[in-house]
Structures are given as structure tokens and as C-alpha cells.
């Protein structure tokens, strides 16, 4: 009752290994690391056969098949490259995930290298079987910004791609007769979120309470250069409009808001986020130079009713920008206190502009980002949002523009976006 000699499968072994096998002897067939027992098209770790009474084995010896990790999972905003020839996905094969540069960057500078494990899963030394994350790169325009610029009042055209975070926000309340329509600017923070000033998104019909405009009335344009040609721009409706809960319409304290876009926008040379600053109550240092862009009124003598009667034609057709120095807080406070009226420049604001005037932001630039280049991270950071100024004409002597100090609201912004700050560390100015 002796059974025939057994040949172990290629890349496998049989245990116990004996010269002879008799009735009731059992053999366990297993495969080398990275191989699986294959029997009748079923994969298993081991397979047992038995020597029968009639001197035959209960089953044929199975084969050993190399483990296949199959096609790796798609990475949002990422690419996969195969290290092995013929795009092999079997045991010990290597793949490399990378992000769509220069618009996305891998979180935590991960290598992105995954190896097909003996268990049949793609494994990374740090992340294990989890996929890496591609985060939008921030504050790095595809075009470098020139050092010498003039003003929005008086006009200097921005080249396409200079301010890829710039958003045009159009609010049109069609529930009103006549339709109420206005515009402002905003800054892209991620593929789904726009930062702007709260007063841009507040319904002025209500003064006794601060009520945001209905999200159905908000349209956001990104990648827009010339307002006469919106064909190249990405337009998105709003999924949510979030005003800062403490926004005060008396003095514009806490003038900050967020719009969540209905769908994430594809990033590219003309659509890229700006970086958020560190959480720091001091805000930007006095005399630091910042840039602001906008399609607001570029002629200081245009009245609001002229804008309305001509539609959006008194918007600057082409995006304008200006370079302005941060004004010491005390100087700005004094300049407003000396005016008739209870203008209060709070600790949540900073001022920018020139004593002699001539360069300024204006009506319609509201909500736009005042950006400063951070030498350490080599990125543009949103330090301010165009908030208020006046009451004199834009660009008047000793009438500084007042900006929301974004660094006071970093935690609030992350909280609204639902992202813990640690997860998005690359987006924070270092």
C-alpha cells in the first residue's frame, strides 16, 4: 500500500519529506514566500493530500503561482510608474506614486515607492497599504512675479498665471426685483475652498442681523484674466457660504468668510492655491511689501451707480495689481481717528498703502488677497483680505486701505475646511 514518490511543485515544498509514503500518511504542500498554492483555480496558503488504501494519492500535487498584487489603486492628482519591465504587478515588483507636479505635492515628502508584498498587497515602508496623499501646492505661481509694479488705481495689467489663486466672486440675488448684483474677489486655498471678506457675501437687505447671501446666488470664477472672456476660466457654484460668526457690520471686525465650491477645481498653471500664514497675532511686519490684485474700479472717480448702469464694464477688463507697504498699526489708527467718524482699526486688521496716496485698492477689489512672499518657504502667503477704507476716494492722500489680518484666523479657516492643520502642514508657511 505504498504511494508513488512525490515531486514538490516549482517554488514549493512538501512536508514531511520522506523516501516512502504509506496508507494514511499525510503531506502538506506549501509554496515559497511570494507564491500561493493554486488548486483548481483556487488560491490557498497550503494544501493537504493523503495516501489512500489503494496506493494512490487523494489529489494531484497543486502548482505554486507567484503572488499578484494586481493593478495598483488610482491616486487622486497622482501618477503611477512601474519600476519593472512589462509593468509587472507580481511579488517584489515595485511601483512609484508621484503627484502631478508642480500643482500637487506628496504629503510628508513620502518616497511614493510601493512593493508587492508576499500577501498580495502593495506596501509602503511608512504608510503600509494606505495610499499617499497629493496636496495642492500653494503660493507658487507658474510665472514669477516682477518686482516693480504700479497700482490698481491707475492700473497695471497682470499677466495670466501671475495670481493663480485670484477668484472673481459674482453675487446675483435673483429673488429681488430688480435683481441685485455685485462682485468681489477671493483667494483659492485648496481645490474646494475660497477665502474672501465677509462683507462680500453678506446680504445688505438685512442690517439688524448678519445674514449670508444664499449659496444659489454665488458664482466663483477661477483662472480668469480678462472679464470679457470667461471661456478659459473655470466657473463653479457654491456648496456652502460661511461668514465668520463674529463679523461686525458696524466696524468690519472679523471681516472674513469662506466659500466651499460645489466641485473641486482642477489645478493648473492658471489655477493654484495661495498659502495660509502661520497663526501669529502680530500679522505682517510694518513696511513689508505685499501684492494685491483685483478687477475693481481702476478709475477712482467712477461712482457705484455708473458701474450698475454700465453692467460690469467699469470693472477693469484685465486683472490689475498693486504693490503696497504694510503701514505701522499706530500710524494707521491715528490716521483714521483723526477723521470724522468712529472708524476703528482693530487688532484683527492691518493697513497698507502710501501716505501720499495714488496707489490703492478700491470698491470691487473687496475680499482679494494681500500676499507677501515668504523667503523661508519661497512661497506667496495670504496675509490680508481687502476689507475697507475711506470715506474719501480710493487712492486719496493718507487714506490707507484696511485689510483683514488673516493670521488671526488660521485655526478658524482650518476648522471650517475640516482639515486638521497637521495633515496639511505643507500648506502652512514655515
Amino acid at each position: 500500500n505504498e504511494c508513488p514518490e512525490l515531486q514538490p511543485p516549482v517554488h514549493g515544498k512538501i512536508e514531511p519529506s520522506q523516501a516512502k509514503y504509506f496508507f494514511k500518511d499525510q503531506v502538506l504542500v506549501s509554496c515559497d514566500t511570494g507564491y500561493k498554492v493554486l488548486k483548481d483555480n483556487v488560491e490557498m496558503d497550503t494544501f493537504q493530500i493523503e495516501c489512500l488504501k489503494d496506493g494512490t494519492w487523494s489529489n494531484k500535487i497543486p502548482t505554486c503561482k507567484i503572488v499578484d498584487c494586481r493593478a495598483p489603486g488610482e491616486l487622486e492628482h497622482g501618477l503611477i510608474t512601474f519600476s519593472t519591465r512589462n509593468n509587472l504587478t507580481t511579488y517584489k515588483s515595485e511601483i512609484k506614486y508621484s503627484c502631478q507636479e508642480p500643482y500637487y505635492k506628496m504629503l510628508n515628502n513620502n518616497t511614493g515607492i510601493y512593493t508587492c508584498s508576499a500577501q498580495g498587497v502593495w506596501m509602503n515602508k511608512v504608510l503600509g497599504r494606505s495610499l499617499p496623499t497629493c496636496l495642492p501646492e500653494c503660493g507658487q505661481p507658474s510665472r514669477s512675479l516682477p518686482s516693480l509694479v504700479k497700482r490698481i488705481i491707475g492700473g497695471r495689467n497682470a499677466e495670466p498665471g501671475l495670481f493663480p489663486w485670484q477668484a472673481l466672486i459674482v453675487v446675483e440675488d435673483t429673488s429681488r426685483v430688480p435683481n441685485d448684483k455685485w462682485f468681489g474677489s477671493g483667494a483659492l486655498l485648496s481645490a474646494s475652498w475660497i477665502l474672501t471678506a465677509a462683507h462680500v457675501l453678506r446680504s445688505q437687505r438685512r442690517d439688524t442681523t448678519v445674514i449670508p447671501v444664499s449659496k444659489e446666488h454665488v458664482t466663483v470664477y477661477l483662472g480668469l484674466h480678462d472679464v470679457r472672456d470667461k471661456s478659459g476660466a473655470v466657473n463653479s457654484s457654491a456648496a456652502r457660504v460661511v461668514l465668520h460668526p463674529d463679523f461686525n457690520i458696524q466696524n468690519y471686525n472679523h471681516d472674513i468668510a469662506l466659500v466651499q465650491l460645489q466641485e473641486p477645481v482642477p489645478l493648473g498653471p492658471h489655477v493654484m492655491p495661495v498659502c495660509l500664514p502661520r497663526l501669529e497675532p502680530e500679522g505682517p511686519a510694518p513696511h513689508m511689501l505685499g501684492l494685491v490684485a483685483g478687477w475693481g474700479i481702476s478709475n477712482p472717480n467712477v461712482t457705484v451707480d455708473e458701474i450698475i448702469s454700465s453692467g460690469t464694464r467699469t470693472l477693469s477688463d484685465v486683472l490689475q495689481y498693486v504693490k503696497l507697504p504694510v503701514v505701522p498699526h499706530a500710524e494707521c489708527k491715528t490716521s483714521y481717528e483723526s477723521r470724522s467718524g468712529n472708524y476703528s482699526v482693530t487688532e484683527n486688521m492691518f493697513c497698507a498703502g502710501y501716505y501720499e496716496g495714488g496707489k490703492d485698492t478700491c470698491l470691487g477689489d473687496s475680499g482679494g488677497a494681500f500676499v507677501i512672499f515668504d523667503d523661508l518657504s519661497q512661497r506667496w502667503v495670504v496675509q490680508g483680505l481687502v476689507s475697507w477704507g475711506g470715506p474719501e476716494e480710493c487712492g486719496s492722500k493718507q487714506v490707507y486701505g484696511v485689510y483683514t489680518k488673516v493670521s488671526n484666523y488660521v485655526d478658524w479657516v482650518w476648522e471650517q475646511m475640516g482639515l486638521p492643520q497637521s495633515v496639511v502642514e505643507p500648506q502652512v508657511e514655515r
Epitope: 453675487v171 426685483v177 441685485d180 448684483k181 455685485w182 445688505q204 457705484v304 450698475i308
Partner: antibody
Framework: QIQLVQSGPELKTPGETVKISCKAS????????ITWVKQAPGKGLKWMGW????????TYADDFKGRFAFSLETSASTAYLQINNLKNEDTTTYFC?????????WGQGTSVTVSS | DIVMTQAPLTLSVTIGQPASISCKSS???????????LSWLLQRPGQSPKRLIY???KLDSGVPDRFTGSGSGTDFTLKISRVEAEDLGVYYC?????????FGGGTKLEIK
């Protein structure tokens, strides 16, 4: 500190045009709308409409559509009410008041007399 | 248009006594945002109107707490717990919920 100061009394003949000003101070002008209210001698108040000082869009009550126009000069923090083709029944006092729904600060009123 | 009906037309009160003015609207003033945009204003003789109460019951700063506003839906009341000489004038209710916004006809408060 918040004030709305209106222009002085006006004496006009029928068919003429009058433009009343309302200068705001003490707050950010574009943060509140301006509402216009009519008060005939010895009578009650009548809501004429309001203008959004941020967008510049005016809204008129039905009785004030046509000959009445609200406008702004934002750089001067001033709102205007213009009445064209004046009629005798336009003889009244016109008030400007702050807000679309606040009506918390009022101008002193501008008396318009239309007489041939 | 929403009609705002005030009662009484004239109210003669002795100083130190309470007073009550009613304002009824032809439609509910509860807005879709959950707030009721009803205000009370006082116009003293020869002066501009002055807001006393907004959002039905909120007192403006500087307004004495002897004034109270109450009500909901279509029925609203302004009460003065103890009338003083400076309270004389015409009281108006005003709704800011439905376009066109409308004022009540006014209630003249006289001192007996």
C-alpha cells in the same frame, strides 16, 4: 457719532427736478443700505424704497417707480434722491435712514415745496 | 402689500401710568430666516423718527427699559410701564419682512 445729514429745504415749481442729498458719517458707508421715507404734512410715514450701497442697486415701492431715482456717490459717502417732473403732491418731507431693514439712524429730513 | 394696523389712533395717558399700543399685520412677519422684522419708532413733535425697538423685542441702546416690545406672527404690542413727559409723540410700527416694507398709520401719545 453716526450721522446722516440731509440737504436744505427746496422750493420748486411743477415740472422741475429736485435732487436731495444725504451725507453719512461715522460708519463704513458701504456696509448699510440707505432707505428713503416720505412724510406728507401731518401724515404718517411711507416707505419709498432703498439702495444697496455696496452694489448700487435701488429698489422702489410701486408708488415711487418712474419719476424717483436713488443714486450714490460712494467716495463722498453720500446717497441721493432725485425727483423728476415734480407735482404738487410731492410737497412733503423726505427722510433718509440707514439700512435696508435697520432704520436705526435718520437724517433730519428735507422739506420740498412744489408751488406754481 | 402688507397692511399694518395700529390701535388706538390716539392715547391719552397720565404721567407715571402704563400705556400699550397694538400693531397687527395682514400677514405673518416671520421671515424664512426665522426672524421677525418688526420695529417700533417714535417721532417726537418737529423731529425725525427714532428707532426704539427692533426684531420685535430688542431695545436700542439708550432707550429706557420701561419700553418693552412683544408679539409674534401678526400681533405685536409696545408697552410703556410708566409714561414720562419725554415719551409724547407719534409711535409707528414698521415691518421689514415683506417687500414693499410698510409702516403702521401711527399712534399719537398725549399726556393728560
Amino acid at each position: 457719532q453716526i450721522q446722516l445729514v440731509q440737504s436744505g429745504p427746496e422750493l420748486k415749481t411743477p415740472g422741475e427736478t429736485v435732487k436731495i442729498s444725504c451725507k453719512a458719517s461715522g460708519y463704513i458707508f458701504t456696509s448699510y443700505g440707505i432707505t428713503w421715507v416720505k412724510q406728507a404734512p401731518g401724515k404718517g410715514l411711507k416707505w419709498m424704497g432703498w439702495i444697496n450701497t455696496y452694489s448700487g442697486v435701488p429698489t422702489y415701492a410701486d408708488d415711487f417707480k418712474g419719476r424717483f431715482a436713488f443714486s450714490l456717490e460712494t467716495s463722498a459717502s453720500t446717497a441721493y434722491l432725485q425727483i423728476n417732473n415734480l407735482k404738487n403732491e410731492d410737497t412733503t418731507t423726505y427722510f433718509c435712514t440707514r439700512g435696508g431693514d435697520a432704520l436705526d439712524y435718520w437724517g433730519q429730513g428735507t422739506s420740498v415745496t412744489v408751488s406754481s | 402689500d402688507i397692511v399694518m394696523t395700529q390701535a388706538p389712533l390716539t392715547l391719552s395717558v397720565t404721567i407715571g401710568q402704563p400705556a400699550s399700543i397694538s400693531c397687527k399685520s395682514s400677514q405673518s412677519l416671520l421671515d424664512s430666516d426665522g426672524k421677525t422684522y418688526l420695529s417700533w419708532l417714535l417721532q417726537r413733535p418737529g423731529q425725525s423718527p427714532k428707532r426704539l425697538i427692533y426684531l420685535v423685542s430688542k431695545l436700542d441702546s439708550g432707550v429706557p427699559d420701561r419700553f418693552t416690545g412683544s408679539g409674534s406672527g401678526t400681533d405685536f404690542t409696545l408697552k410703556i410701564s410708566r409714561v414720562e413727559a419725554e415719551d409724547l409723540g407719534v409711535y409707528y410700527c414698521w415691518q421689514g419682512t415683506h417687500f414693499p416694507y410698510t409702516f403702521g398709520g401711527g399712534t399719537k401719545l398725549e399726556i393728560k
